[in-house]
Amino acid sequence: QEGKFSGPLKPMTFSIYEGQEPSQIIFQFKANPPAVTFELTGETDNIFVIEREGLLYYNRALDRETRSTHNLQVAALDANGIIVEGPVPITIKVKDINDNRPTFLQSKYEGSVRQNSRPGKPFLYVNATDLDDPATPNGQLYYQIVIQLPMINNVMYFQINNKTGAISLTREGSQELNPAKNPSYNLVISVKDMGGQSENSFSDTTSVDIIVTENIWKAPKPVEMVENSTDPHPIKITQVRWNDPGAQYSLVDKEKLPRFPFSIDQEGDIYVTQPLDREEKDAYVFYAVAKDEYGKPLSYPLEIHVKVKDINDNPPTCPSPVTVFEVQENERLGNSIGTLTAHDRDEENTANSFLNYRIVEQTPKLPMDGLFLIQTYAGMLQLAKQSLKKQDTPQYNLTIEVSDKDFKTLCFVQINVIDINDQIPIFEKSDYGNLTLAEDTNIGSTILTIQATDADEPFTGSSKILYHIIKGDSEGRLGVDTDPHTNTGYVIIKKPLDFETAAVSNIVFKAENPEPLVFGVKYNASSFAKFTLIVTDVNEAPQFSQHVFQAKVSEDVAIGTKVGNVTAKDPEGLDISYSLRGDTRGWLKIDHVTGEIFSVAPLDREAGSPYRVQVVATEVGGSSLSSVSEFHLILMDVNDNPPRLAKDYTGLFFCHPLSAPGSLIFEATDDDQHLFRGPHFTFSLGSGSLQNDWEVSKINGTHARLSTRHTEFEEREYVVLIRINDGGRPPLEGIVSLPVTFCSCVEGSCFRPAGHQTGIPTVGM
């Protein structure tokens, strides 16, 4: 019957387990005349066969590790051997069985870790491979620490990422590792396939030797320094310390300032050497460097941030000794005459620079005082009372008080009453012809002079001409400056010209007065002129399609996964070569041709997300010009950190002898992201031998209670191992130790004879 094992020729996919001897046919294809036979091509490997009647089968066991997918094609042929149907793709997917064991790439690994390194930050990776399919449990590897030597107080100082093989310090390791006490450790690491979840999994082991080194070289917190300090200088503001004595400290001014007001002494103490002025510079970023006796840096420089805090040490300043405005005779009440804009050098958007305006005097007071008003915060002057008469009073002088919260300044404004504006500007030429310029012509260059005239009262806003480009320059690449004496317009380049987007621009100018025209008079064609700008090509650097490219991937993506891509185009159409800059963690590589970005190492959200690198696009050939953009890789969390204790629980005690069973509460955490509901840990005792003495019960997702099962405990310290499972995907488990001391008590505290004061427990239960 047609169906599962027979039917017409069409694209099909079949899944077959590797390692199985053939037991049945794969499919029987049915021919439609004139087709009479079938032909098989593609990745047959002499395993797959089709009989002339269309019976597809395989003749020996498959091996996924040799070929995971066989891409075959089946065609139906007529009696002349001519293809009359197909060829259609037939895909054989070889399903994996666990027929390969994981193997470590090295039988011994060596590494070092600095004391107090961040918990969870990998300092060494062990790596095993398994030829089985990583998309199935058969190839999913699970790393575990089998033993840590030495094991002090049953506390694990090291942890391994079960999935990635990344070895890092536990919280306890970060706090307690001390090279003076124990400079080296050995770990035995196992790797299992089947995600570590099956009795039938294969495994391998390796040895890891770890050297512990000291580290106190850390950037201090940002410093805030109030400007204009009157304290005696130098003033110590912060400090850095190298791990070993004898380092030579120096500061590097990355901004190359003419005056660098900071110093460092040979202890690593950092000073400000003179009062700072926020108005000169509001923040400093510089580096502290530690060098050896030969002047060679001992490590990366530390970034020092100093922010200068503002005080109100600047009064408002007037824009000019006298600010001149004009008002036409026929202006209406409320019309804007102009805006007085005073300045204050103190910090913007603070009370120190917030200004108020007030008119304190008008002269002459004709025909009356109070002809003008000023908006308190905006500084805009308006006509307040009546239209003015030039023949009566051609000029008014105002004194305006401008104040911040501590200072007052007087500014002077002259208001000239001018004739009505009843003449329009007239261009001397309506067409200024063609002008050819290279696209790299300097910004600020004057490229054309234009001229219009206006018959209104000279040197007033009615005859002053302002030129505007009203057409042909939507990008705002050009501007026109006006000579106030001659009304000549100078056309200048304001933004770079661009051959690629605007090779020819038909520019239209409009000549206008700053003063409004009287009612009934309008600008006409005489106030307009045109010219044509022709731009010629110059080689330019490539242009990225975005300033910042952003991508988002899971932190556990396989090495070699495409994590994003960038695109740039060369304005001249040259090919582009991409490269990366600032890949400090060595996580990424970029395809020089396509701009696709791939991972080349395990990623770690806990090491910091987003991860920022620069991408460089360089012309191939030509002048090899290049441009830079940013690539931000946002790492999404996976469950790759086992649970641990939320804090240090050393010092737990019960008073001996116990009068009744007691209990204590502890809290767990882990470094993975817990959105919305928070962690949901489960708790159990770490070994069966503890069951007789102890009991652990869950309180909520993060807290549990450890209780004694009886009162017959010896007067000594017990280390209780507790297994914490995070219930994630995959679930990760941490084994933590709670040290609990049973001791004689005096007034509810542990009593120890003199000479036994080390590690006194401080928490009674």
């Epitope: 005349p33 004139p34 009479v36 002339r52 007529d78 009696a79 002349n80 051997g81 001519i82």
Partner: antibody
Amino acid sequence: QVQLVQSGAEVKKPGSSVKVSCKVSGYTFTDHTIHWMKQRPGQGLEWIGYIYPRDVITQYNEKFKGKVTLTADKSTSTAYMELSSLRSEDTAVYLCARWGYFYGSRSYYFDYWGQGTTVTVSS
Amino acid sequence: DIVMTQSQKFMSTTVGDRVNITCKASQNVGTAVAWYQQKPGQSPKLLIYSASNRYTGVPDRFTGSGSGTDFTLTITNMQSKDLADYFCQQYSSYPWTFGGGTKLEIK
């Protein structure tokens, strides 16, 4: 050795029919297709169609559909071409040929030909 | 239908010459082309198949070349016994078609 022997020349009246035979020997008749071609004096060859004796599958050139019927007799290893409603433009030499392909081979060619049969249509 | 065009109906040649007989297909036929020789009063004989493969027993002075739409049969060192009609044929798609033929003659 492989041979294709065609029947002798025919003179026919317009409107009548004629059946030309092509007897093969030297190979298994059902393994190969037999094709028929028309050749008029001083002109090229025209492909009429083929028959596959094994499954009695035929395929015709659209131009000859309704004009030609191809049949085969497996018992005598003979292929036949019948021309109906004869007209003067059917006057030609008709050739049978064996197509060399058989299952699993790559022999895409006419490797053996009959000697040709002349059909003359005249009133 | 695919039209096979042999643009030269007749070609004059001399013994010892190198002769190129061309055939152009009206659309792409890949390499599904055969060449046949036919002498007066005889049936055609296969020379070349799959555009460039010489059939068993055919002298090596006959060679075929080309793919897609342009094909050539080359006879190097022309012999008098090679005077005949030469046909190309496509079997890429039905109906199969032949070229009109090129007849070789002595100059």
